[in-house]
Protein backbone atom coordinates (compact mmCIF):
# COMPACT_ATOMS: atom_id res chain seq x y z
CA UNK A 1 0.00 0.00 0.00
CA UNK A 2 0.90 3.67 -0.26
CA UNK A 3 1.78 5.76 2.80
CA UNK A 4 0.33 9.25 3.20
CA UNK A 5 3.09 11.63 4.32
CA UNK A 6 1.35 14.99 3.90
CA UNK A 7 -2.21 16.22 4.01
CA UNK A 8 -4.30 16.62 0.84
CA UNK A 9 -5.13 20.08 -0.50
CA UNK A 10 -7.78 21.85 1.62
CA UNK A 11 -7.08 19.62 4.64
CA UNK A 12 -5.56 20.88 7.90
CA UNK A 13 -2.68 19.04 9.56
CA UNK A 14 -2.63 18.68 13.33
CA UNK A 15 -0.70 16.21 15.50
CA UNK A 16 0.03 13.78 12.63
CA UNK A 17 -3.58 13.74 11.45
CA UNK A 18 -5.33 15.54 8.60
CA UNK A 19 -8.73 17.16 9.06
CA UNK A 20 -11.29 18.40 6.56
CA UNK A 21 -14.12 20.66 7.68
CA UNK A 22 -17.29 20.72 5.61
CA UNK A 23 -19.02 23.97 4.83
CA UNK A 24 -22.52 22.57 4.37
CA UNK A 25 -24.61 19.79 5.82
CA UNK A 26 -25.43 16.14 5.21
CA UNK A 27 -27.13 13.35 7.12
CA UNK A 28 -24.72 11.36 9.32
CA UNK A 29 -24.57 8.30 7.01
CA UNK A 30 -23.85 10.45 3.96
CA UNK A 31 -21.15 12.33 5.86
CA UNK A 32 -19.67 8.99 6.96
CA UNK A 33 -19.61 7.73 3.37
CA UNK A 34 -18.16 11.02 2.16
CA UNK A 35 -15.19 10.64 4.51
CA UNK A 36 -14.68 6.99 3.56
CA UNK A 37 -14.50 7.93 -0.10
CA UNK A 38 -11.75 10.35 0.85
CA UNK A 39 -9.94 7.39 2.49
CA UNK A 40 -10.71 9.00 5.83
CA UNK A 41 -13.33 8.69 8.58
CA UNK A 42 -15.59 11.00 10.55
CA UNK A 43 -13.50 12.65 13.25
CA UNK A 44 -12.68 10.54 16.31
CA UNK A 45 -11.95 12.68 19.36
CA UNK A 46 -9.42 11.03 21.64
CA UNK A 47 -8.27 13.90 23.85
CA UNK A 48 -9.18 17.29 25.25
CA UNK A 49 -6.48 18.81 23.07
CA UNK A 50 -8.05 17.34 19.91
CA UNK A 51 -11.48 18.48 21.10
CA UNK A 52 -10.23 22.07 21.39
CA UNK A 53 -8.58 21.92 17.96
CA UNK A 54 -11.75 20.72 16.26
CA UNK A 55 -13.93 23.11 18.22
CA UNK A 56 -11.73 26.03 17.15
CA UNK A 57 -12.19 25.15 13.47
CA UNK A 58 -15.91 24.41 13.43
CA UNK A 59 -17.08 27.32 15.55
CA UNK A 60 -20.54 27.36 17.18
CA UNK A 61 -22.17 25.09 14.61
CA UNK A 62 -23.74 21.63 14.99
CA UNK A 63 -21.22 19.23 13.42
CA UNK A 64 -21.22 15.43 13.11
CA UNK A 65 -18.43 13.31 14.57
CA UNK A 66 -17.63 9.62 14.10
CA UNK A 67 -19.60 8.36 17.09
CA UNK A 68 -22.93 6.53 16.98
CA UNK A 69 -25.04 3.91 18.75
CA UNK A 70 -27.15 2.77 15.79
CA UNK A 71 -26.43 -0.89 16.62
CA UNK A 72 -26.77 -0.68 20.40
CA UNK A 73 -23.66 0.48 22.28
CA UNK A 74 -21.85 3.70 21.47
CA UNK A 75 -19.03 3.11 18.97
CA UNK A 76 -16.34 5.18 17.31
CA UNK A 77 -16.12 4.57 13.56
CA UNK A 78 -12.42 3.68 13.67
CA UNK A 79 -12.78 1.13 16.47
CA UNK A 80 -11.42 3.36 19.25
CA UNK A 81 -12.81 2.08 22.55
CA UNK A 82 -15.70 4.25 23.70
CA UNK A 83 -15.94 3.19 27.32
CA UNK A 84 -12.34 3.98 28.22
CA UNK A 85 -11.93 6.91 25.83
CA UNK A 86 -12.37 10.67 25.96
CA UNK A 87 -15.94 11.99 26.31
CA UNK A 88 -17.35 15.49 26.32
CA UNK A 89 -21.13 15.15 26.50
CA UNK A 90 -23.42 17.97 27.51
CA UNK A 91 -25.05 17.46 30.92
CA UNK A 92 -27.76 14.75 30.79
CA UNK A 93 -26.59 13.65 27.34
CA UNK A 94 -26.79 11.31 25.56
CA UNK A 95 -30.51 10.89 26.22
CA UNK A 96 -31.82 9.06 23.11
CA UNK A 97 -34.70 11.53 23.06
CA UNK A 98 -37.86 10.37 21.29
CA UNK A 99 -39.80 13.61 21.62
CA UNK A 100 -38.64 15.16 18.35
CA UNK A 101 -41.47 13.48 16.42
CA UNK A 102 -39.24 12.25 13.63
CA UNK A 103 -39.48 8.60 14.58
CA UNK A 104 -37.00 6.63 16.68
CA UNK A 105 -34.52 8.07 19.13
CA UNK A 106 -31.16 9.76 18.69
CA UNK A 107 -28.26 7.60 17.54
CA UNK A 108 -25.57 9.94 16.20
CA UNK A 109 -23.28 12.28 18.10
CA UNK A 110 -22.44 15.86 17.15
CA UNK A 111 -20.59 18.86 18.49
CA UNK A 112 -23.05 21.49 19.70
CA UNK A 113 -22.65 25.26 19.58
CA UNK A 114 -20.43 25.21 22.68
CA UNK A 115 -18.40 22.21 21.51
CA UNK A 116 -19.85 19.73 23.96
CA UNK A 117 -21.54 16.66 22.54
CA UNK A 118 -25.17 15.74 22.03
CA UNK A 119 -26.92 12.78 20.46
CA UNK A 120 -29.38 13.63 17.70
CA UNK A 121 -31.44 12.22 14.86
CA UNK A 122 -28.97 10.85 12.29
CA UNK A 123 -30.94 12.28 9.37
CA UNK A 124 -30.38 15.88 10.37
CA UNK A 125 -28.22 17.73 7.81
CA UNK A 126 -25.30 18.88 9.93
CA UNK A 127 -21.79 19.83 8.91
CA UNK A 128 -19.13 17.20 9.49
CA UNK A 129 -15.38 16.69 9.95
CA UNK A 130 -13.28 14.04 8.23
CA UNK A 131 -10.00 12.79 9.71
CA UNK A 132 -7.20 10.62 8.38
CA UNK A 133 -3.94 9.71 10.05
CA UNK A 134 -0.59 10.52 8.49
CA UNK A 135 2.02 7.76 8.11
CA UNK A 136 -0.77 5.20 7.99
CA UNK A 137 -0.30 2.76 5.11
CA UNK A 138 -3.51 2.69 3.07
CA UNK A 139 -4.00 -0.92 2.07
CA UNK A 140 -4.91 -1.49 -1.56
CA UNK A 141 -6.86 -4.73 -1.90
CA UNK A 142 -5.33 -7.26 -4.29
CA UNK A 143 -6.93 -7.47 -7.71
CA UNK A 144 -8.84 -10.67 -8.30
Amino acid sequence: GSERTCCPVNWVEHERSCYWFSRSGKAWADADNYCRLEDAHLVVVTSWEEQKFVQHHIGPVNTWMGLHDQNGPWKWVDGTDYETGFKNWRPEQPDDWYGHGLGGGEDCAHFTDDGRWNDDVCQRPYRWVCETELDKASQEPPLL
Epitope: S2, D30, A31, R36, S138
Partner: antibody, heavy 121, light 108 residues
Framework: EVQLLESGGGLVQPGGSLRLSCAAS????????MNWVRQAPGKGLEWVSV????????YYADSVKGRFTISRDNSKNTLYLQMNSLRAEDTAVYYC??????????????WGQGTMVTVSS | DIQMTQSPSSLSASVGDRVTITCRAS??????LNWYQQKPGKGPKVLIF???SLQSGVPSRFSGSGSGTDFTLTISSLQPEDFATYYC??????????FGQGTKVEIK
Protein backbone atom coordinates in the same frame (compact mmCIF):
# COMPACT_ATOMS: atom_id res chain seq x y z
CA GLU B 1 -4.07 16.37 -20.83
CA VAL B 2 -6.49 14.82 -18.36
CA GLN B 3 -8.06 11.80 -20.01
CA LEU B 4 -10.08 8.65 -19.28
CA LEU B 5 -10.30 5.87 -21.85
CA GLU B 6 -12.69 2.95 -21.37
CA SER B 7 -12.37 -0.45 -23.05
CA GLY B 8 -13.66 -3.99 -22.74
CA GLY B 9 -17.25 -3.58 -23.87
CA GLY B 10 -18.93 -5.95 -26.28
CA LEU B 11 -21.73 -8.42 -26.85
CA VAL B 12 -22.36 -10.98 -24.12
CA GLN B 13 -25.13 -13.49 -23.44
CA PRO B 14 -27.44 -13.19 -20.41
CA GLY B 15 -25.74 -14.72 -17.39
CA GLY B 16 -22.30 -14.02 -18.87
CA SER B 17 -19.41 -11.92 -17.62
CA LEU B 18 -17.35 -9.00 -18.86
CA ARG B 19 -14.55 -6.86 -17.44
CA LEU B 20 -14.34 -3.19 -18.32
CA SER B 21 -11.17 -1.14 -17.97
CA CYS B 22 -10.58 2.59 -17.75
CA ALA B 23 -7.09 3.96 -18.35
CA ALA B 24 -6.44 7.32 -16.69
CA SER B 25 -3.81 9.91 -17.53
CA UNK B 26 -2.96 13.52 -16.78
CA UNK B 27 -3.75 13.52 -13.05
CA UNK B 28 -2.67 11.81 -9.83
CA UNK B 29 -4.94 8.82 -10.19
CA UNK B 30 -4.53 7.45 -6.65
CA UNK B 31 -5.73 10.73 -5.13
CA UNK B 32 -9.25 10.50 -6.49
CA UNK B 33 -12.32 8.37 -6.05
CA MET B 34 -13.42 6.92 -9.39
CA ASN B 35 -16.88 5.98 -10.64
CA TRP B 36 -18.72 3.94 -13.22
CA VAL B 37 -21.86 5.54 -14.64
CA ARG B 38 -24.01 3.92 -17.32
CA GLN B 39 -26.52 5.05 -19.90
CA ALA B 40 -29.00 2.65 -21.49
CA PRO B 41 -29.79 3.34 -25.16
CA GLY B 42 -31.89 6.49 -25.44
CA LYS B 43 -32.07 6.84 -21.65
CA GLY B 44 -30.56 8.97 -18.90
CA LEU B 45 -27.50 8.54 -16.70
CA GLU B 46 -27.35 6.03 -13.83
CA TRP B 47 -24.58 5.93 -11.24
CA VAL B 48 -23.29 2.35 -10.88
CA SER B 49 -20.32 2.21 -8.51
CA VAL B 50 -17.53 4.18 -6.84
CA UNK B 51 -14.16 3.30 -5.32
CA UNK B 52 -11.99 5.44 -3.06
CA UNK B 53 -8.50 6.51 -4.10
CA UNK B 54 -6.74 3.71 -2.22
CA UNK B 55 -9.31 1.11 -3.26
CA UNK B 56 -10.27 0.44 0.37
CA UNK B 57 -13.86 1.65 0.12
CA UNK B 58 -16.39 0.66 -2.52
CA TYR B 59 -20.10 1.31 -3.03
CA TYR B 60 -22.67 0.04 -5.53
CA ALA B 61 -26.10 0.91 -6.83
CA ASP B 62 -28.74 -1.56 -5.63
CA SER B 63 -29.33 -2.62 -9.25
CA VAL B 64 -25.83 -4.14 -9.54
CA LYS B 65 -24.97 -5.07 -5.95
CA GLY B 66 -23.68 -8.61 -5.66
CA ARG B 67 -23.09 -8.90 -9.42
CA PHE B 68 -20.57 -6.13 -10.21
CA THR B 69 -17.19 -5.52 -8.58
CA ILE B 70 -15.23 -2.28 -8.89
CA SER B 71 -11.46 -2.29 -8.39
CA ARG B 72 -8.39 -0.28 -9.30
CA ASP B 73 -4.67 -0.72 -9.86
CA ASN B 74 -3.01 2.54 -8.94
CA SER B 75 0.37 1.34 -10.23
CA LYS B 76 -1.23 1.08 -13.69
CA ASN B 77 -3.54 4.11 -13.37
CA THR B 78 -6.43 1.83 -14.29
CA LEU B 79 -9.99 1.38 -13.03
CA TYR B 80 -11.93 -1.86 -13.55
CA LEU B 81 -15.51 -3.08 -13.45
CA GLN B 82 -16.04 -6.84 -13.29
CA MET B 83 -19.60 -7.58 -14.39
CA ASN B 84 -21.07 -11.02 -13.66
CA SER B 85 -24.54 -12.53 -14.06
CA LEU B 86 -25.30 -9.97 -16.75
CA ARG B 87 -28.92 -9.19 -17.62
CA ALA B 88 -30.58 -7.56 -20.62
CA GLU B 89 -31.21 -4.45 -18.51
CA ASP B 90 -27.45 -4.01 -18.05
CA THR B 91 -27.19 -3.09 -21.74
CA ALA B 92 -25.75 0.42 -21.79
CA VAL B 93 -22.79 2.62 -22.53
CA TYR B 94 -20.52 2.50 -19.49
CA TYR B 95 -18.55 5.61 -18.60
CA CYS B 96 -15.81 5.99 -16.04
CA UNK B 97 -15.81 9.33 -14.27
CA UNK B 98 -13.46 11.05 -11.85
CA UNK B 99 -14.96 12.42 -8.67
CA UNK B 100 -14.01 15.98 -7.80
CA UNK B 101 -14.48 17.34 -4.29
CA UNK B 102 -13.50 20.63 -2.68
CA UNK B 103 -14.71 22.66 0.28
CA UNK B 104 -17.98 23.19 -1.56
CA UNK B 105 -18.19 20.88 -4.56
CA UNK B 106 -18.88 17.18 -5.13
CA UNK B 107 -19.26 16.22 -8.78
CA UNK B 108 -17.86 14.22 -11.70
CA UNK B 109 -15.48 16.56 -13.47
CA UNK B 110 -13.84 14.22 -16.01
CA TRP B 111 -15.62 11.56 -18.08
CA GLY B 112 -14.45 9.02 -20.60
CA GLN B 113 -15.99 8.49 -24.02
CA GLY B 114 -17.73 5.30 -22.89
CA THR B 115 -17.73 1.63 -23.91
CA MET B 116 -20.86 -0.18 -25.08
CA VAL B 117 -22.04 -3.33 -23.33
CA THR B 118 -24.80 -5.33 -25.04
CA VAL B 119 -26.42 -8.23 -23.20
CA SER B 120 -28.42 -10.33 -25.63
CA SER B 121 -28.90 -13.93 -26.70
CA ASP C 1 -33.16 7.33 -3.13
CA ILE C 2 -33.73 10.97 -4.01
CA GLN C 3 -35.62 11.36 -7.29
CA MET C 4 -34.63 14.16 -9.66
CA THR C 5 -37.26 15.42 -12.11
CA GLN C 6 -36.34 17.71 -14.99
CA SER C 7 -38.68 19.78 -17.10
CA PRO C 8 -39.24 20.03 -19.92
CA SER C 9 -37.96 16.70 -21.26
CA SER C 10 -37.27 18.42 -24.57
CA LEU C 11 -37.53 21.89 -26.05
CA SER C 12 -37.03 23.59 -29.39
CA ALA C 13 -35.28 26.94 -29.46
CA SER C 14 -33.47 29.27 -31.82
CA VAL C 15 -29.97 30.70 -31.67
CA GLY C 16 -30.05 33.73 -29.40
CA ASP C 17 -33.00 32.52 -27.34
CA ARG C 18 -32.99 32.48 -23.56
CA VAL C 19 -33.49 28.91 -22.37
CA THR C 20 -34.48 27.76 -18.90
CA ILE C 21 -34.41 24.17 -17.65
CA THR C 22 -35.74 23.24 -14.23
CA CYS C 23 -34.84 20.40 -11.91
CA ARG C 24 -36.83 19.34 -8.84
CA ALA C 25 -35.57 17.05 -6.08
CA SER C 26 -37.92 14.78 -4.15
CA UNK C 27 -36.43 16.09 -0.89
CA UNK C 28 -34.24 18.94 0.29
CA UNK C 29 -30.72 18.63 -1.13
CA UNK C 30 -29.45 21.97 0.15
CA UNK C 31 -27.31 23.23 -2.76
CA UNK C 32 -25.79 19.88 -3.79
CA LEU C 33 -26.89 20.17 -7.40
CA ASN C 34 -24.67 19.85 -10.50
CA TRP C 35 -25.47 20.34 -14.19
CA TYR C 36 -23.98 18.38 -17.11
CA GLN C 37 -24.10 18.76 -20.88
CA GLN C 38 -23.96 15.74 -23.19
CA LYS C 39 -23.65 15.69 -26.95
CA PRO C 40 -24.46 12.60 -29.06
CA GLY C 41 -21.81 9.89 -28.87
CA LYS C 42 -19.82 11.73 -26.19
CA GLY C 43 -19.42 11.52 -22.44
CA PRO C 44 -21.10 14.18 -20.29
CA LYS C 45 -19.29 17.39 -19.39
CA VAL C 46 -19.83 19.24 -16.13
CA LEU C 47 -21.09 22.79 -16.55
CA ILE C 48 -22.07 23.92 -13.07
CA PHE C 49 -21.08 22.72 -9.59
CA UNK C 50 -23.09 23.17 -6.43
CA UNK C 51 -26.07 25.03 -7.92
CA UNK C 52 -24.27 28.08 -9.32
CA SER C 53 -20.47 27.66 -9.63
CA LEU C 54 -19.35 27.62 -13.25
CA GLN C 55 -16.78 25.02 -14.23
CA SER C 56 -13.57 26.54 -15.58
CA GLY C 57 -13.85 27.22 -19.31
CA VAL C 58 -17.65 27.15 -19.42
CA PRO C 59 -19.09 30.27 -21.09
CA SER C 60 -20.76 32.83 -18.82
CA ARG C 61 -24.04 32.53 -20.74
CA PHE C 62 -24.64 29.45 -18.58
CA SER C 63 -25.88 30.09 -15.06
CA GLY C 64 -27.54 28.15 -12.29
CA SER C 65 -29.73 29.04 -9.35
CA GLY C 66 -32.02 27.56 -6.72
CA SER C 67 -31.84 25.85 -3.35
CA GLY C 68 -33.62 23.18 -1.38
CA THR C 69 -35.67 21.27 -3.93
CA ASP C 70 -36.01 23.59 -6.94
CA PHE C 71 -33.17 24.47 -9.29
CA THR C 72 -32.73 26.17 -12.64
CA LEU C 73 -30.18 26.10 -15.46
CA THR C 74 -30.34 29.15 -17.71
CA ILE C 75 -28.65 29.74 -21.05
CA SER C 76 -28.93 33.48 -21.60
CA SER C 77 -28.34 33.45 -25.36
CA LEU C 78 -28.37 30.03 -27.00
CA GLN C 79 -25.44 29.32 -29.31
CA PRO C 80 -25.19 26.63 -32.03
CA GLU C 81 -22.82 24.55 -29.89
CA ASP C 82 -25.35 24.49 -27.02
CA PHE C 83 -27.74 22.11 -28.75
CA ALA C 84 -27.35 19.03 -26.55
CA THR C 85 -28.96 17.12 -23.68
CA TYR C 86 -28.65 18.57 -20.17
CA TYR C 87 -28.75 16.59 -16.93
CA CYS C 88 -29.02 17.67 -13.32
CA UNK C 89 -27.47 15.53 -10.59
CA UNK C 90 -27.77 15.61 -6.81
CA UNK C 91 -24.72 14.92 -4.69
CA UNK C 92 -26.40 15.30 -1.31
CA UNK C 93 -26.69 11.57 -0.68
CA UNK C 94 -23.22 10.04 -0.76
CA UNK C 95 -22.70 7.96 -2.79
CA UNK C 96 -26.18 7.16 -4.14
CA UNK C 97 -25.94 10.06 -6.55
CA UNK C 98 -28.93 10.41 -8.86
CA PHE C 99 -29.50 12.21 -12.16
CA GLY C 100 -32.52 13.80 -13.74
CA GLN C 101 -33.92 12.14 -16.85
CA GLY C 102 -32.43 14.81 -19.12
CA THR C 103 -33.62 17.75 -21.20
CA LYS C 104 -32.90 17.69 -24.92
CA VAL C 105 -32.40 21.14 -26.45
CA GLU C 106 -33.12 21.01 -30.19
CA ILE C 107 -32.96 23.53 -33.01
CA LYS C 108 -36.30 25.11 -33.88
Amino acid sequence: EVQLLESGGGLVQPGGSLRLSCAASGFTFSSYAMNWVRQAPGKGLEWVSVISGSGSNTYYADSVKGRFTISRDNSKNTLYLQMNSLRAEDTAVYYCAKRYTSDWHDAFDIWGQGTMVTVSS
Amino acid sequence: DIQMTQSPSSLSASVGDRVTITCRASQNINNYLNWYQQKPGKGPKVLIFTTSSLQSGVPSRFSGSGSGTDFTLTISSLQPEDFATYYCQQSYTTPTWTFGQGTKVEIK
